[in-house]
Structures are given as C-alpha cells and as structure tokens.
C-alpha cells in the first residue's frame, strides 16, 4: 500500500489534455525530494518523462511540465496534445530512483467520437447560442416546422412555425427562414445551458414525406486555463466573451463551494481581500476585458470564472470563462513587508523589488486607486517626473543591478495613506503592492535641520545643519538637492565619521551644508537623509530660498514652504528601516492591479518622460560647491 | 433547491454485488467532481471512490481497500453518478454517501472538500 495517492484512471480525448495531481505524505525530506513521472514498461521498467530535477524526455517536449506544490504536499503533471500513442500505464512517485514511492496511475486516451453519418453535431459554450440548420423538400415548404428535443419516451416541442414555445425556451428560442431561401429554416436559441445539450429532431412536414434532421447539441462548459504564480507575483485574467456581450457589467468571481462569489465588477463592487491589489480593465468594444491581481497569496488559488450580465453578478446562461490558479510557494520574488509605517511630517524609504537580471527597466511608482474600475496614476518613475503635487517630497533611488530600487516620500501626511505599487516595463510578475500607514506623531522627529527659515542671501555663503541621534552615528549621512527629476546626492565627506569617538554626545550631532556661494540656482528643496550603504532610511526635508540682500538685513522671513518641512520616522521605524537584521520598512510585495492599467501607467510614464537619470546620484550637477562637515562640540 | 438523490443500497451476501446510483438536482454548476463515501456505525464517514472531470477528461479515484473490486462512473452533464460493487465483503457494510463538487481540485479523500451531500443509502453485507 503507496502512502502517495492520485487518480487511478485517466481518460481523454486525442489532442486534449490532462493535469494529473498526485498527493504525498506531509514531510520535510518528501517536499525537498525529487518527484517524477514515468513510463511504465512491459518488463516492469519505469522509464522517466520528466521529473522535478528538469528533466524531459524527446516525446514530452515542449507539451509536458510538473510542478511540485509543497505548501499543499502535491505535485502536479500537465500534458497537452494526447495521441493514442500515450495511452499506458505510468507511475507518479517520489525518490531518487524510480523505485521510490510511487502510484500507479492509467491513463487512455480515445478517438474523438464518431456520431452516425447523419447526425449534425453543434459544440457550444455555456451563455452562447447556436443556430441550427434545418433543411427541407420544396414539397413541404408550406408545411409546419419544428424543432424538438429527445426524451427517453417522445420528443419534447422546443419550437414551431405556428409561434408555439416550449416555456423553458421562451425568450431564448426563434424559428426564421433567411431571404427567399424556401429549402431550409433556422431555429436559434441564446443563453445555452448545460440543460439544452442533447439530441434534437428538427422537421417540415407530417407524416412519411416528412424532412427529418437529427441534431446533436454539445454544451460545454469552457475547460479551466491552468495558470501557475509564484507567491507575491502577479496574474491577469484575459477573459475575452464576445461581441455580444460587449455593453453588459463584466465580472470575476472565485468559486466557493456551491457559488461564485463576485471579487470585482464594472459596477463598482469589490472584495475587501483583495482591496489595493485588483484593476479590472475594460480592453475593447468587443466584450474583452482584464482582471489584475497582485501580490498574490497562498489563499488566491482556486478557480475563477470572469463573465457579463447586467447585473455584474453570474447568471447561467451567459457566456463565462474559467481559469484554475495554482500559487507555488517557492517562489522568486522575495518576501518583504508589506505595510508600511509612517508618521506625520515623517518620511518612509520604501525597498521595491524588480527581477536582478531587467536591471535597465524603467522603474515607477503609483499610487492604487479604488474608485470606478480602479486605476494606477504614476507618481514617479525612472523616466517619469514626480507629480506636481508631490513637490520636493518624492523621489525614485535606482541601484542598478541589485534587484531593489527605492522610493523615498517625506512630509507624511494622514491623506498619504493608502497602497502604492512598485512596478517596471518589464517582467510583469513582479509587480508588489505596500499599503502605506500614516499615524500622527507623538515625539520630536529624528532628524532636524536648521535654521528652519531657509533664506539664502545671494552671493554669500549660507549653512544648513541637519541634527541626528546617535543611533546615527554609524551611518552614512547626505544632503541631496531635491528635483523633479529625483534627489541629486551631494558630494560629501563626512569628516567626524573618520574620528574615533567612544561617547556620543546626543545634543551635538549634526552633519551641515554649506552653499558658497548662493547662485540663484541654489533655490529649492533639499533633502538631510541616512542610510547604511544601498539601504535608504530616515529623511527631512527643506526649502531654501534666495533672495538678493536688502538693505538693513541680510535674512527675511520664513517661506510658507517650509511649514512641511520637519520630517521624520517614529524611532522604532527608523531603526528598522536602517538595520540589516530587521527590514520592517523595506515592504513586502502585498497586493495588487491590471495588465492594461499597467500600459497605461506605461502610457502616462511615456508622456512625463523627461532627460536626465531620476534618482541617480550622476544625473545633474550642481553650481554651487557643498561640503558635509560633522561638528564635535 | 440542491438535492443528491442515491439508490441501489440493500442486503447482500458476501461474495455479491450492488450497483449505487446517484443524480444531482438544483445544481448551480455542472459538477465537477462526485464522490462516494461510506460511513460504519459508530465510525467516521470514508472516502470509497470518486470522479472528477476538466472537460472532456475524466480523474477515477479509490480507496485502497476497493481497488480492484468496485468501479465508479458518472455523467458530468446529466450529473450522475454510479458505483459499481463486487466481490462484496462484510467490511463493506455501511450507509454510502454521495457527494458533488463545483471543480476538481483539492484532495478528494477529505469529506470537507465536498459542498453538496445526499441522504445516503444503506448497503448491508450478510450471510
């Protein structure tokens, strides 16, 4: 007796295929151990066609996979394109050798099925309609027509010439000739059901001279899409229903038990599981649309069916398609944090992840957005300029290469929460949603500069200071010049950095800019940021202004702009943000949105496409010098 | 209203055989997986057989202790289901449940991957 355990006969059709799932004992070594799938022969050999080691035999190239499911102690063998040539006895088994655990499972594969020669035979999909063909004698042109349907004893009347209509057809059913044609008439019937499939009699005429036509009515429901996601990686359903279906609320729903519950519609309504990771996209005027779902879960696999009905709801009798979503475990997208904290006047550093080997992609962020279909606006990007309304308080950090770019947002505010995506043009799978949380603040910030009324005197040197704690210290210090382009690093040294220090002294830690002399050019946000090497943390924001000295007095008021710009993290944040071992504001890849939102969010990413690197530390120069000095008081 | 109707059950000697039959009413979808499981007095309810179909592809499942000697069938469409039973044993004693799906997924030994159940119908094997 096998403790492995899957379906003992197979049965198909040439050119279909199959998904054979085979169970194993819930252990450590049978999870990490090699599965296979083979032959087995007249001897009592079992000749491996493919198994988890990457293996493929020449006959199951390029229409087989298996893909092991450790999270649900099963693996799983697809093979497309049957012949009769596959039909045979197989095993599925764990173990180095085939002689390993195994089940045995058969599989045959038939001839399509032939009907008798005069039989016309119509394959439907669910919701579709078919129209028969019926023809006749001339002779019998003035006679009655009808369709009826086979029943054990008698055929059931689905339809006639004389406007007579069974009740389980009304509605659906119509019986017309096409022009001047008097040799055949035509019976339509809409919204199919699995309860219209059967054998139906359609005839002209009574008696002897009666024209006969057997019909065969195949209603099929549309054969699951197998469709494989890693964890935290994203799906899109393409669900494509037809022309006629192009003006009624599309939707997608997941099978649970005996109903579909509705996930999304285009009427508005959405599972609160999925809020800030779906898109629904109308494609075109044909009935096609998309469905986006990222930041895929453990708990997202099942089976969905998209389909249309004005009611936004599944309807028998409308036309659906189905998919089978199967979430791997072991997956490549590594796992981050996927909420996000924040204070008021704080910042966030938020770690986006991108697949290593598209390290040229052009990278953004948006911002998730729930009303109507919901939709994605880019609010930064690579090649994107930073929206106007995120002036001087964002920015995209590209570190080419190590799979991580980072978008830093400051002067938090309670209207900044929500979920935000990290996104490229390139490997869509890894699109990664972080919800973003913004508490009031309690505490002082970490970082703050000063003079906090950054006026900037034309021609004279002006220093900004930018107090930190010391836990601190260690880190890497910089001031960048904030555009719109990204936040320019200024070259530094930080020279007390170098100097040993066994105490700390919390009130004098500072690292300053100085602009000598102010330029014109100088005008604008600047950002007093730490991090530990690729590793962005804590910021603060400030805008200094230039003005030409006047008489009397070399400082003016302070600009309104400036009334944000004290920024900084709650310290526990700070410190996760920063340290290595706890990444608590580096986001994991959460939810997400849809394949023609993601275009237009390429789209809008094309028109705001601007020269110059956004975010990288050689992407523009500065005229002004600027120096970091660490004071020790 | 949903309703799994079985019939076939009875008395027979051991050695004999039965023929189960099950028909599904009121279903919200074409089943897409049926399956029988016996329950013993005073025992928890067990997976027999089962059948589940993607398309035009049909899945036979059994328990280890019926291979060989029971075989199950079923009609997707018309969504019924029969059992087959030989060579029947006093062990086989028991009130056989018929059970329906929506798809074809998840492991089909466990009862709490099937919605739908019928009334059951007892089989009772004696000399």
């Known amino acids: 007796k096998s403790p492995i355990f899957g379906p003992q006969e197979v049965s198909s059709i040439e050119g279909d295929s199959v998904s054979i799932t085979c169970y194993y004992p819930d252990t450590s070594v049978n999870r990490h151990t090699r599965k296979y799938w083979c032959r087995q022969g007249a001897s009592g050999m079992c000749t491996t066609l493919i198994s988890s080691n990457g293996y493929l035999s020449k006959e199951y190239s390029g229409r087989a996979n298996l893909i092991n499911f450790p999270e649900n102690n099963t693996f799983v063998i697809n093979i497309e394109q049957l012949t009769q040539d596959d039909t045979g006895s197989y095993k599925c088994g764990l173990g180095t050798s085939n002689r390993g655990l195994s089940f045995d499972v058969s599989l045959e594969v038939s001839q399509v099925p032939e009907l008798p020669s005069d039989t016309h035979v119509y394959t439907k999909d669910i919701g579709r309609n078919v129209t028969i063909e019926c023809p006749f004698k001339r002779e019998n042109a003035p006679s009655k027509k009808s369709l009826c349907k086979k029943t054990n004893q008698s055929c059931e009347l689905v339809i006639d010439s004389t406007e007579k209509v069974n009740p389980s057809y009304i509605g659906r059913a119509k019986l017309f000739m096409k022009g001047t044609d008097l040799t055949v008439f035509y019976v339509n019937i809409s919204h199919l059901t699995h309860n219209d499939a059967g054998l139906y009699i359609c005839q002209a005429g009574e008696g002897p001279s009666a024209d006969k036509k057997n019909v065969d009515l195949q209603v099929l429901a549309p054969e699951p899409e197998l469709l494989y996601k890693d964890l935290r990686s994203s799906v899109t359903f393409e669900c494509d229903l037809g022309r006629e279906v192009a003006n009624e609320a599309k939707y997608l729903c997941r099978m649970n038990k005996e109903t579909c519950d509705v996930i999304i519609n285009t009427l508005g309504k959405r599972d609160p599981d999925f809020e800030g990771r779906i898109l629904i996209t109308p494609k075109d005027d044909n009935g096609r649309f998309s469905v986006l779902i990222t930041g895929l879960r453990k708990e997202d696999a099942g089976h969905y069916q998209c389909g249309a009905h004005s009611s936004g709801l599944p309807q028998e009798g409308w036309p659906i398609q189905t998919w089978q979503l199967f979430v791997n475990e072991e997956s490549t997208i590594p796992n981050r944090r996927s909420v996000v904290k924040g204070v008021t006047g704080g910042s966030v550093a938020i770690a986006c992840p991108y697949n290593p080997k598209e390290s040229s992609s052009l990278k953004y962020w948006c911002r998730w957005e729930g009303d109507g279909n919901g939709h994605c606006p880019v609010l930064v990007g690579t090649q994107a300029q930073v929206q106007e309304e995120y002036e001087g308080r964002l920015a995209l950090f590209d570190q080419p290469g190590n799979g991580t770019y980072t978008v830093i947002l400051n002067q938090l505010t309670t209207e900044d929460a929500g979920f935000y995506w990290c996104l490229t043009n390139g490997d869509s799978r890894w699109r990664t949603t972080i919800e973003l949380q913004v508490a009031e603040a309690t505490r002082e910030p970490n970082l703050e500069v000063t003079p906090q009324n950054a006026t900037a005197v034309l021609g004279e040197t002006f220093t900004v200071s930018c107090h930190y704690p010391c836990k601190f210290y260690s880190q890497e210090k910089y001031w960048c010049k904030w555009s719109n382009k990204g936040c320019h690093i200024l070259p530094s040294h930080d020279e007390g950095a170098r100097q040993s220090s066994v105490s700390c002294d919390q009130s004098s830690q500072l690292v300053s800019m100085t602009l000598n002399p102010v330029s014109k050019e100088d005008e604008g946000w600047y950002w007093c940021g730490v991090k530990q090497g690729q590793t962005y943390g804590e910021t603060t924001a400030i805008y200094i202004a230039v003005e030409e000295r006047t008489r009397g007095s070399s400082h003016v008021n302070p600009t309104d702009a400036n009334a944000r710009a004290k920024v900084a993290l709650e310290e526990e944040v700070v410190d996760s943000s920063i340290s290595e071992k706890e990444n608590k504001a580096i986001p994991n890849p959460g939810p997400f949105a849809n394949e023609r939102e993601i275009q237009n969010v390429g789209d809008q990413a094309q028109e705001n496409r601007a020269s110059g690197d956004a975010g990288s530390a050689d992407g523009q120069s500065r005229s002004s010098s600027s120096k970091h000095h660490h004071h020790h008081h | 209203q949903v309703q799994l109707v079985e019939s076939g059950g009875g008395l027979v000697q051991p050695g004999g055989s039965l023929r189960l039959s099950c028909v599904a009413s009121?279903?919200?979808?074409?089943?897409?997986?049926m399956a029988w499981f016996a329950q013993a007095p005073g025992k928890e309810r067990e997976f027999v057989a089962a059948?589940?179909?993607?398309?035009?592809?049909?899945?036979?499942y059994y328990a280890d202790s019926v291979k060989g000697r029971f075989t199950v069938s079923g009609d997707n469409a018309k969504k019924t289901l029969d059992l087959q039973m030989k060579d029947l044993k006093p062990e086989d004693t028991a009130l056989y449940f018929c059970?329906?799906?929506?798809?074809?997924?998840?492991?089909?030994?466990?009862?709490?991957?099937?919605?739908?159940w019928g009334q059951g119908t007892q089989v009772t094997v004696s000399s």
């Open positions: 059948i589940g179909w993607r398309g035009r592809t049909s899945y036979k």
């Open positions: 059970a329906a799906h929506p798809n074809d997924d998840g492991d089909p030994r466990i009862s709490g991957n099937y919605q739908y």
């Open positions: 009121g279903l919200p979808f074409s089943s897409s997986r």
